[in-house]
Amino acid sequence: EEELQVIQPDKSVLVAAGETATLRCTATSLIPVGPIQWFRGAGPGRELIYNQKEGHFPRVTTVSDLTKRNNMDFSIRIGNITPADAGTYYCVKFRKGSPDDVEFKSGAGTELSVRAKPSAPVVSGPAARATPQHTVSFTCESHGFSPRDITLKWFKNGNELSDFQTNVDPVGESVSYSIHSTAKVVLTREDVHSQVICEVAHVTLQGDPLRGTANLSETIRVPPTLEVTQQPVRAENQVNVTCQVRKFYPQRLQLTWLENGNVSRTETASTVTENKDGTYNWMSWLLVNVSAHRDDVKLTCQVEHDGQPAVSKSHDLKVSAHPKEQGSNTAAENTGSNERNIY
């Protein structure tokens, strides 16, 4: 009678993570008597995967009933496959011995490869906001994919970026891999509504890449431009001075009026108007009773935007050299929260 052979018909098996792998194995004879074991890897460092004789194998089931007398099918199924299960599996026949069973014959091995999807890319931007014309870095990370081959692209508002560096780790063989990429983006004043997108393509995604996004609104700071203007006289001896705060982002802004260097009023931007590009405009105004002043008045609009050092714009209010009228420094009309009378 011919000597027993252990046949593993599949040289390789490819399984998606989460699925069940079937590893086929048959013996050509019932003799010699003894159990079958499955191992991952060869040599002394191999891992025992399934033992017909004893043990507990929550994820492993046999394809056929190994207790049946004439059974020669020793195929197994491994459930809920993960990239960590990748490797070469050997079906090994043991001959009954005393005190220990003795390894008799091994199959040629089946290489189990696991295809695992990359995790959703996570894009993160700089910790602090930056202003237009500055270059900022964005990082994109995705983990847990196999095989190693992967493609990563960067886009800003649909336009592909070219200034980026990508690494896939580890460099050598591994059960799964990670990708890390850093892209450099130059900010413009129009970027409040812009998006940076990291796109990852992998064989497991069937042509439907994964995307991670970052909104530049989280990254950009557009400093305001200031303009102080004197409006036509509203009433006798009264001048309306406005401070136009334009094109700023984010909204966090505090404005202080100074009269000849002394603080007159401080207010926080509330009812702002939004521009098409996502920046904001705001206007504050001050009602000045010029008859209360003998000398010229220097009015300063000082703005602190998003915690940055204050910027300011001044306006010199000319006081004409007419004699003060009686009672001109008594209460002037105060028609709104943004008005201020000088006495």
């Epitope: 159990p35 074991q37 991952r40 460092g45 891992e47 025992l48 995967i49 399934y50 033992n51 017909q52 004789k53 004893e54 043990g55 507990h56 194998f57 929550p58 994820r59 492993v60 491994i78 960590a84 299960d85 043991f94 011995g97 005190p99 220990d100 069973d101 003795v102 390894e103």
Partner: nanobody, 124 residues
Framework: QVQLQESGGGVVQAGDSLRLSCVAS????????MGWFRQAPGKEREFVAG????????YYADSMKGRFTISRDNAKNLVYLQMNSLKPEDTAVYYC?????????????????WGQGTQVTVSS
């Protein structure tokens, strides 16, 4: 050289549960079969439970089957032994073991590396 440190032992009542932990110093922990042995006063050290390096296969001594569960966390270099429905006869020093030696298809009865042990006392 693999260094093993057990923790989680103590004194419990019969019927109680206890979870033992063992942390390994080895960076290649995921390439080591791990297990637990125990030694009661005046007795030989005996195999309790073993787990293969990926955790796919587990082995239990007959008297522990159904009551004890071995598990591992390769990311943290940890192996656990969850012991339920403890009996006074489970009183022993429990040892963590690494690189189990399997002979043929028998349960492991040896190891290359041992921890210092943690005392488990089950009072009736």
């Amino acid at each position: 050289q693999v260094q093993l440190q057990e923790s989680g032992g103590g004194v419990v009542q019969a019927g109680d549960s206890l979870r033992l932990s063992c942390v390994a110093s080895e960076r290649t922990f995921s390439s080591l079969d791990m297990g637990w042995f125990r030694q009661a006063p005046g007795k030989e050290r005996e195999f309790v439970a073993g787990i293969s390096r990926s955790g796919i296969s587990q082995y239990y001594a007959d008297s522990m089957k159904g009551r004890f569960t071995i598990s591992r966390d390769n990311a943290k270099n940890l192996v656990y032994l969850q012991m339920n429905s403890l009996k006074p006869e489970d009183t022993a020093v429990y040892y963590c073991a690494a690189a189990l030696t399997f002979r043929g298809s028998n349960l492991p009865r040896d190891s290359n590396y041992w921890g210092q042990g943690t005392q488990v006392t089950v009072s009736s």
